[in-house]
C-alpha cells in the first residue's frame, strides 16, 4: 500500500517516510485499521526496526534514527534482541541506545527505560573499561554469540533504530 | 595512582586448598573486572579468570574452571582467589591485574604458592 | 583456543640498534575495527608491565623507543634503539576470544 492511499482520512497527519509497509488489522468495529513501518525497515510485535548499513559516532547515530522520528535500539525482551541479531551481520558492530555518559557504570537507556542488571547480555568480561561508554551489539565466535560490548562512542559503527509501528 | 597489594607466599600440601587476596587502590574498585593470571616458574603466563565485584559476575579459562574460585568484597575493595585440590603443578605465582582497557594495564606484585609435601 | 606463536624465542641485538619481535596469532583477533592484541614486558622477579595495548597504543610513561603495528593474525613489536634497560621477556597477548592467551616469550639480550 502507498503512504499516499492510506491518508485519504489522515492528512493532518505528518510523517518523514514517503513509503509505509502496512498489514491490515482486525478490528471490532468496522472501520479498517492499519499497522505500518516505513519502507525496508523491519517489523517485530509493536516495533519497526532499521539496521544501517554506514558508520557514524554513536551520537550522530542517535540523531540520525531522530531524522528518522525514531530513537537507537532499547532492548526490552530476549526475544526482540533475538529478532534483531537473526538480521544483523557477524563481522560488524551496532550500536543500540545505551550509555554510560558519566564513566560511572551507571548505564542509561535513551528513552528512560530503566537499565535492569539482571536482564542484561554482556559478553563474558564486558563492559571492559569506564573510558568506554557506548554499547554495541557485536559477534564472538567464543563461545559463538551476539552480546554487549562497550566501545568508545565515538568511533564508527553501525547502529538500529527503533520506533513504533504506525497505526493508520 | 592505581596499586593491588596481594598477599604474602604460601606453602601448602598436595590436595589442599589455599586462598589468596588482592587489595586495590587509587580507582573505584566496582568500575572495573579484576583479572587472574599464572606464571609457573621459568615459564610462561596463562589466564585464569576475572570476576566483575561490582555484581559479582564471573568468567573463567575452562582449564581453571574447577580449580579455581573468585570472589570480591567490596566494602574491602578485595577479591580473593580460592585454589582447590593442590598438586605440584599449582606451584606457581599468581598475579592479579586490572584492565586498561582490553589488555592487563595494572599488575599486584603476585603471590607465590609452592605445593610441597 | 587462539595460539599466539612468537618469533624468535630470544634474539641479541646491539646497543642503538633495532629489534624486531613477531607474534602471528591462529586467526584473527580483529574485531569492529579494533586489533586485541598487546605487548608485555617482564623482567626477573617482576610483574609483566604492559607497553602496548590494541595493537599499535602506546601505553602511557612508556617511552617512544617502543611501538607496535599489524592487523588480524600478524603483530610486530619494535624497540629502536634497544638500551640496556630493555634486556627482557616480551609477550603478546590477545584479549578478542575467550580464553584470554599469551604468546610463549621473546628473551631480548644485548649483544
Known amino acids: 500500500q502507498k503512504y499516499s492511499q492510506l491518508l485519504e482520512k489522515k492528512t493532518t497527519k505528518e510523517l518523514v517516510h514517503t513509503t509505509l509497509e502496512c498489514v491490515k488489522k482486525n478490528m471490532p468495529v468496522e472501520e479498517t485499521a492499519w499497522s505500518c513501518c516505513p519502507k525496508n525497515w523491519k517489523s517485530f510485535s509493536s516495533n519497526c526496526y532499521f539496521i544501517s548499513t554506514e558508520s557514524a559516532s554513536w551520537q550522530d547515530s542517535e540523531k540520525d534514527c531522530a531524522r528518522m522520528e525514531a530513537h537507537l535500539l532499547v532492548i526490552n525482551t530476549q526475544e526482540e534482541q533475538d529478532f534483531i541479531f537473526q538480521n544483523l551481520q557477524e563481522e560488524s558492530a551496532y550500536f543500540v541506545g545505551l550509555s554510560d555518559p558519566e564513566g560511572q557504570r551507571h548505564w542509561q537507556w535513551v528513552d528512560q527505560t530503566p537499565y535492569n542488571e539482571s536482564s542484561t547480555f554482556w559478553h563474558p568480561r564486558e563492559p571492559s573499561d569506564p573510558n568506554e561508554r557506548c554499547v554495541v551489539l557485536n559477534f564472538r565466535k567464543s563461545p559463538k554469540r551476539w552480546g554487549w560490548n562497550d566501545v568508545n562512542c565515538l568511533g564508527p559503527q553501525r547502529s538500529v533504530c527503533e520506533m513504533m509501528k504506525i497505526h493508520l | 595512582e592505581v596499586q593491588l597489594q596481594q598477599s604474602g607466599t604460601v606453602l601448602a600440601r598436595p590436595g589442599a586448598s589455599v586462598n589468596m587476596s588482592c587489595k586495590a587502590a587509587?580507582?573505584?574498585?566496582?568500575?572495573?573486572?579484576v583479572y587472574w593470571v599464572k606464571q609457573r616458574p621459568g615459564q610462561g603466563l596463562e589466564w585464569i579468570g576475572a570476576?566483575?565485584?561490582?555484581?559479582?559476575?564471573?568468567s573463567y579459562n575452562q582449564k581453571f574452571q574447577d580449580k579455581a574460585t573468585l570472589t570480591a568484597v567490596t566494602s574491602a575493595s578485595t577479591a580473593y582467589m580460592e585454589l582447590s585440590s593442590l598438586t605440584n603443578e599449582d606451584s606457581a605465582v599468581y598475579y592479579c591485574t586490572r584492565p586498561h582497557y582490553d589488555s592487563f594495564g595494572y599488575w599486584g606484585q603476585g603471590t607465590l604458592v609452592t605445593v610441597s609435601a | 583456543d587462539i595460539v599466539l606463536t612468537q618469533s624468535p624465542a630470544s634474539l641479541a641485538v646491539s646497543l642503538g640498534q633495532r629489534a624486531t619481535i613477531s607474534c602471528r596469532a591462529s586467526e584473527s583477533v580483529d574485531s569492529y575495527g579494533i586489533s586485541f592484541m598487546h605487548w608485555y614486558q617482564q623482567k626477573p622477579g617482576q610483574p609483566p608491565k604492559l607497553l602496548i595495548y590494541?595493537?599499535?597504543n602506546q601505553e602511557s610513561g612508556i617511552p617512544a623507543r617502543f611501538s607496535g603495528s599489524g592487523s588480524r593474525t600478524d603483530f610486530t613489536l619494535t624497540i629502536n634503539p634497544v638500551e640496556a634497560d630493555d634486556v627482557a621477556t616480551y609477550y603478546c597477548q590477545q584479549s578478542n576470544e575467550d580464553p584470554l592467551t599469551f604468546g610463549a616469550g621473546t628473551k631480548l639480550e644485548i649483544k
Open positions: 587509587g580507582y573505584s574498585f566496582t568500575s572495573y573486572w
Open positions: 570476576i566483575y565485584p561490582k555484581n559479582s559476575r564471573t
Open positions: 590494541r595493537a599499535s
